[in-house]
Interface confidence: low
């Protein structure tokens, strides 16, 4: 049986059940290399409290559809008196990066995971030439996820002091110059994740090979190497390589750009101080508030919730967007869709799409940006579920009793962007984390 998602085959992936201190290792095409789980385990469960291992999915007992992968085992489990077998079930959804498998829940018999990934899309529009896993778990099983830094087009310019060259990088994947043919990037070779531009020439100085690694809990490392044997004439016979170290800052701060810290014989060392390198619980919440010692800040957007069936309305030329954030009130136009953001076509109001659902909500505060994300909306033709990204800005003089109002700023590949000036986005900072 052919591998259902070949892009995901090259790596053993990890997911964590934080509540029960369990680490899962997942290899969807072969078996995980963990002796304690046996030679054919595709999903190996490591219980860190008891230091025991259990195979909860066998690579030989795999069944697949386009959106679901199931691994059975021969291990019995009791469920309401019937003799079931332990199994793992991975639901795949279209995403814009390779993404990460997320542990959802488990019963006594079934371990459930969800994975939003380019590999599950109906069209190849989000697929990279080369992409590697962009997250890690530290020794405390806390997730550090750099997926939000991945650019689907364009690249980051590295801050360096050399006026004759410009070094551009992407995070965990190659630079897509076709979707964003900026003048400087246009000459970058396909597949490069680190592109050195000198005048009108561009050179590949590194491609992603291995996934993100954790050095210490506040330092993550990504390494790029130039795969082709052909040496660059300005590298003194050395093969180019790029090492990017992502550093979680010791306290809350605005974002910085990547900085070149060392350069020798085409070996480039870059340091990037960014809160995305911090563990995800420091940055994100599933509710509309972020507070407590762990987050170093107090943010509460719940006063923006609308009651009594009213919604915020944002004009998007062809469409009107109805928003009801931080609550579970149905938007009238999007009845029974559980939408937090509802897209209605002006010329045909029967054409209604959920652009993100209220139970699929993430509030993120990172590098000084406060963002509310609603995902899991109605599918587009690519298979990607519509989502909305609302960027909040502090405005103590906002109208509408300080609440302000969302403004639609654009759409890219079924992701809808809004900005929202409101006094409730004014962040109160605490001390160190």
């Amino acid at each position: 049986q052919a591998a259902p998602f070949p892009e995901l085959c090259s790596y053993t992936w990890e997911a964590v059940d934080t509540k029960n201190n369990v680490l899962y290792k997942i290899n969807i095409c072969g078996s995980v290399d963990i002796v304690q789980c046996g030679p054919s385990s595709a999903v190996c469960m490591h219980d860190l409290k008891t230091r025991t291992y259990h195979s909860v999915g066998d690579s030989v007992l795999r069944s697949a559809t386009r959106s679901l992968l199931e691994f059975n085992t021969t291990v019995s489990c009791d469920q309401q008196g019937t003799n079931h077998r332990v199994q793992s079930s991975i639901a795949f959804l279209c995403g814009k990066t390779l993404g990460t498998p997320e542990f959802v829940t488990a019963t006594e018999c079934v371990h459930y995971f969800e994975w939003r990934t380019t590999a599950a899309c109906k069209k190849d529009i989000f697929k990279a030439n080369k992409e590697v896993p962009c997250y890690v778990f530290d020794e405390e099983l806390r997730k550090h996820d750099l997926n939000p830094l991945i650019k689907l087009s364009g690249a980051y310019l590295v801050d360096d002091s050399d006026p004759d060259t410009s070094l551009f990088i992407n995070v965990c994947r190659d630079i897509d110059t076709l979707r964003d043919p900026g003048s400087q990037l246009r000459a970058c070779p396909p597949g490069t994740a680190a592109c050195l531009v000198r005048g009108h020439q561009a050179f590949d100085v590194g491609q992603p090979r291995d996934g993100l690694k954790v050095v210490r809990k506040d330092r993550l490392v990504l390494s790029y190497v130039r795969e082709e044997a052909g040496k660059l004439d300005f590298c003194d016979g050395h093969s180019p390589a790029v090492t990017i170290t992502f550093v979680c800052p010791s306290e809350r701060r605005e974002g910085t750009i990547p900085k070149l810290t060392a350069k020798s014989n085409c070996r480039y060392e870059i340091e990037w101080i960014t809160e995305y390198a911090c563990h995800r619980d420091y940055l994100e919440s599933k509710t509309c508030s972020l507070s407590g010692e762990q987050q170093d800040v107090s943010i509460d957007l719940t006063p923006l919730a609308q009651s009594g069936g009213s919604s915020y309305i944002s004009d998007g030329k062809e469409y009107l967007f109805y928003l009801n954030v931080c609550g579970e009130t149905e938007i009238q136009f999007c009845n029974k869709k559980q939408a937090a953001v509802c897209q209605v076509k002006k010329s045909d109001t029967s054409q209604v799409k959920a652009a993100g659902r209220y139970h699929n909500q993430t509030l993120r505060y990172s590098d000084g940006d406060l963002t509310l994300i609603y995902f899991g909306g109605d599918e587009c033709s690519s298979g990607f579920q519509r989502m909305s990204v609302i960027n909040f800005r502090c405005n103590k003089t906002a109208g509408n009793d300080g609440k302000g109002t969302p403004v639609f700023t654009g759409e890219v590949d079924c992701t809808y962007f809004f900005t929202w000036d409101t006094e409730y986005a004014c962040v109160h900072h605490h001390h160190h984390h």
Partner: nanobody, 116 residues
Framework: DVQLVESGGGLVQPGGSLRLSCAAS????????MDWYRQAPGKQREWVAT???????TYADSVKGRFTISRDNAKNTVYLQMNSLRPEDTAVYYC??????????WGQGTLVTVSS
């Protein structure tokens, strides 16, 4: 006050059965992972069984097929049903609750003696 209280231990003949109980107070019981451990005289404490917060159960090889862990969320109690007991099962049995929020909480233990 957060505490766990074990009960149900005692003297039983080889091949016999016992049911241990562990009553929890002061915690949201269903959010916690529950473990049973035991410590035989002169030996290190060893893990026996786990009941994850969502119902997944795992057992040490030495008790697999003989012991069953279960819970009653309404009574805030976790149980260890022990069948086909052997002399080597003699130990003080402890229950433990753990969650991402709280430190691990241990009970005071209950003695199980398997002897003819």
């Amino acid at each position: 006050d957060v505490q766990l209280v074990e009960s149900g231990g005692g003297l039983v003949q080889p091949g016999g059965s016992l049911r241990l109980s562990c009553a929890a107070s002061g915690i949201i019981f269903s959010d916690n992972r529950m473990d049973w451990y035991r410590q035989a005289p002169g030996k290190q404490r060893e893990w026996v069984a786990t009941l994850a917060s969502y119902g997944w159960k795992t057992y040490a090889d030495s008790v697999k097929g003989r012991f069953t862990i279960s819970r009653d969320n309404a009574k805030n109690t976790v149980y260890l049903q022990m069948n086909s007991l052997r002399p080597e099962d003699t130990a003080v049995y402890y229950c433990k609750a753990s969650s991402p929020v709280l430190n691990d909480i241990w009970g005071q233990g209950t003695l199980v003696t398997v002897s003819s």
